[in-house]
């Protein structure tokens, strides 16, 4: 309810009649409440007869005039108590007070909601002097009111170190509903309930809310703001908005899209970033996420060799960074690679498969059955071996690398020999007599040098020894190579 300024018990006519420049607005004052249709001019309630001071905050001057008559208490006159008007309208209101002429330099300040209004406000103070008193009228005008102008306005005047304060003038700016909470876009699970919230405020209140789904009203009768719409579930995307109505009319919120979560689309553009003999680095562009964040991805790898058993290797990885290094692959092999990613709803289909090849690698095993013996007549050491298994060559054999280390008292000398891939024997000349020769052999491909075989040692005696048995790599399971003399 609108409360009006109080009537006073002890009238004291300081300034009879209405003042020049009294209350004005840009529209006719009315004394009826606004009806539901809204669009009314401002309402003004002025409960007083002109010329009655209030007893609110009164300064009682101690000064007396020449005739020694005590001066009356000073107080602002009553004015309009509550102004209701529509946004963008203009309004002017005032405070008035009659001050004995003995007071000099009186100034009136305007305050809103406890803060002094300074600067670019349209405040004008007019003085109307008479023989004994000066009528002061302070007017405040707002050319186009906004909601932020809502509030309680008062005048203050300082006299004799006393502060005189007027009754408040309440300005209520009414307009269309203003949304304080609008529905927000969401991604929801199919056929699962969810809530949307809409809140709008006046003044004027009440504000009533209608919900709209895909251009159709959800509720034909409104709900008071704030309103929560519980949607029992959707099977397809929908757009929701809300309408807010009050006595000034209606406003419409933004429309928000509610998406249904689905399995993701398959990744696209799977590409090979880098290949080695035993690994392939791939990247991919994720497909549409189905309105639900990706959780992880699965890389599927099949041997492309038609003779392979068609088994699929699966490597799981995080969804980011759309990059994965596939390891433990065979060298010089062809693979088909596909990528699939999942969200909370499920797995996408597999991306288009791409072909990728590993490069040639260094052999993964050493030559087998290395045998070493001394041919004294030619002063050579003969070495024999068996090729590593083809599968483990990891490429096309281009030759072998032989390491032979000669050790005698105080001397150690390592020499490397490269031999071609044809055959499986080699001959090296004796470097030092009365020494131990340690031989190791590695297979070589264009991919590099493979592991060296276990060392085989042979003792090369001083000149004149007769019989030498060959040395060889041990049979599997033996811990150390054995030198046979």
């Amino acid at each position: 309810a609108i409360t009006e300024a109080r009537e006073e018990a002890k009238p004291y006519p300081l300034f009879p009649g209405p003042f020049p420049g009294s209350l004005q607005t840009d529209h006719t004052p009315l004394l009826s409440l606004p009806h539901a249709s809204g669009y009314q001019p401002a309402l003004m309630f002025s409960p007083t007869q002109p010329g009655r001071p209030h007893t609110g905050n009164v300064a009682i001057p101690q000064v007396t005039s020449v005739e020694s008559k005590p001066l009356p208490p000073l107080a602002f006159k009553h004015t309009v108590g509550h102004i209701i008007l529509s946004e963008h309208k203009g309004v002017k209101f005032n405070c008035s007070i009659s001050v004995p002429n003995i007071y000099q330099d009186t100034t009136i300040s305007w305050w809103k909601d406890g803060k002094e209004l300074l600067g670019a406000h349209h405040a004008i103070t007019q003085f109307y002097p008479d023989d004994e008193v000066t009528a002061i009228i302070a007017s405040f005008s707002i050319t186009s009111v906004q909601r932020s102008d809502n509030g309680s306005y008062i005048c203050k005047m300082k006299i004799n170190n006393e502060e005189i304060v007027s009754d408040p003038i309440y300005i209520e700016v009414q307009g269309l509903p203003h949304f304080t909470k609008q529905p927000e876009s969401m991604n929801v699970t199919r056929n699962t309930a969810f809530n949307l919230t809409c809140q709008a405020v006046g003044p004027p209140e009440p504000v009533n809310i209608f919900w709209v789904q895909n251009s159709s009203r959800v509720n034909e009768q409104p709900e008071k703001s704030p309103s929560v719409l519980t949607v029992p579930g959707l099977t397809e995307m929908a757009v929701f908005s809300c309408e807010a109505h009050n006595d000034k009319g209606l406003t419409v919120s933004k429309g928000v899209q509610i998406n249904i979560k689905a399995i993701p689309s398959p990744p696209t553009e799977v590409s090979i970033r880098n290949s080695t003999a035993h690994s392939i680095l791939i990247s991919w562009v994720p497909g549409f996420d189905g309105y639900s964040p990706f959780r992880n991805c699965s890389i599927q790898v099949k041997e492309a060799d038609p003779l392979s058993n068609g088994s699929v290797m699966i490597f799981n990885t995080s969804a980011l960074p759309h990059l994965y290094q596939i390891k433990q692959l065979q060298a010089l092999a062809n693979y088909s690679i596909g990528v699939s990613c999942m969200n909370e709803i499920g797995w996408s289909a597999v991306s288009p498969w791409i072909l990728a090849s590993t490069t040639e690698g260094a052999p993964s095993v050493a030559p087998l059955n290395v045998t070493v013996f001394l041919n004294e007549s030619s002063d050579n050491v003969d070495i024999r071996w068996m090729k590593p298994p083809t599968k483990q060559q990891d490429g096309e054999l281009v030759g072998y690398r032989i390491s032979h280390v000669w050790q005698s008292a105080g001397i150690s000398k390592e020499l490397l020999e490269e031999v071609g891939q044809n055959g499986s024997r080699a001959r090296i000349s004796v470097q030092v007599h009365n020494a131990t020769c340690t031989v190791r052999i590695a297979a070589v491909t264009r991919g590099g040098v493979g592991p060296f075989s276990d060392p085989v040692k042979i003792f090369i005696p001083a000149h004149g020894w007769v019989d030498y048995a060959p040395s060889s790599t041990p049979a599997p399971g033996n811990a150390d190579p054995v030198l046979i003399i």
């Epitope: 539901a36 249709s37 251009s215 034909e220 109505h245 009319g249 209606l250 406003t251």
Partner: antibody, heavy 121, light 112 residues
Framework: QVQLVQSGSELKKPGASVKVSCKAS????????MSWVRQAPGQGLEWMGW????????TYADDFKGRFVFSLDTSVSTAYLQISSLKAEDTAVYYC??????????????WGQGTTVTVSS | DVVMTQSPLSLPVTLGQPASISCKSS???????????LNWLQQRPGQSPRRLMY???KLDSGVPDRFSGSGSGTDFTLKISRVEAEDVGVYYC?????????FGGGTKVEIK
């Protein structure tokens, strides 16, 4: 002052279509809605439905779903009622009325002068 | 739909005398917020309808206070304390509590 001015009388043959206009002035058109009300000769009033002048969202009473369409041209502050496949029983005066939901409920506060639609072969 | 029944259909009155129109609804018009959205329209001869009263008893601006409304639930009354010549026309009650909005059949007020 809000004013709603409707288009003139129409005489149509059964099966034809008619489009009645309602031009608003004196207020911001998109801050309210427009209801349409039918008054058949010698009969009472029937509420046909309403359209939100901002969003164009329409609501129709059950008896007026299908052949009746509300539309807007906000650039000229005008609401329209189109009736297709006219029948003799569509003969009536059609009123537009400004509408929204205030503290006193649905408002219906300003009415057009009415458009008479006569359907006769 | 809510059926609104007005009586009498026709109401001949003497100028300066009171008049009373009854409106009954097939369902209560009291909504969950405690408001009753029962309204009255006046349609003078050859004119458009005009809003007269809302929320049972609140007069629209510019409506003379010789008009008054009362009632609750399903039974409502429009009274004119002293009928004047300008009051001649058809009066309709209508409800906005339930969807769709529905009107009474109208009561024709004429001077005897």
């Amino acid at each position: 002052q809000v004013q709603l001015v409707q288009s003139g009388s129409e005489l149509k043959k059964p099966g034809a279509s008619v489009k009645v206009s309602c031009k608003a002035s004196g207020n911001t058109f998109t801050t309210y809605g427009m209801s349409w009300v039918r008054q058949a000769p010698g009969q009472g009033l029937e509420w046909m439905g309403w359209i939100n002048n901002y969003s164009g969202v329409s609501t129709y009473a059950d008896d007026f779903k299908g052949r009746f369409v509300f539309s807007l041209d906000t650039s000229v502050s005008t609401a329209y009622l189109q009736i297709s496949s006219l029948k003799a029983e569509d003969t009536a005066v059609y009123y537009c009325a400004r509408d929204y939901y205030g503290s006193g409920g649905w408002v219906f506060d300003y009415w057009g002068q009415g458009t008479t639609v006569t359907v006769s072969s | 739909d809510v059926v609104m029944t007005q009586s009498p259909l026709s109401l001949p009155v003497t100028l300066g005398q009171p008049a009373s129109i009854s409106c009954k609804s097939s369902q209560s018009l009291l909504d969950s917020e405690g408001k009753t959205y029962l309204n009255w329209l006046q349609q003078r001869p050859g004119q458009s309808p005009r809003r007269l009263m809302y929320l049972v008893s609140k007069l629209d601006s510019g409506v003379p206070d010789r008009f008054s409304g009362s009632g609750s639930g399903t039974d409502f009354t429009l009274k004119i304390s002293r009928v004047e010549a300008e009051d001649v026309g058809v009066y309709y009650c209508w409800q906005g509590t339930h969807f769709p909005r529905t009107f009474g059949g109208g009561t024709k007020v004429e001077i005897k």
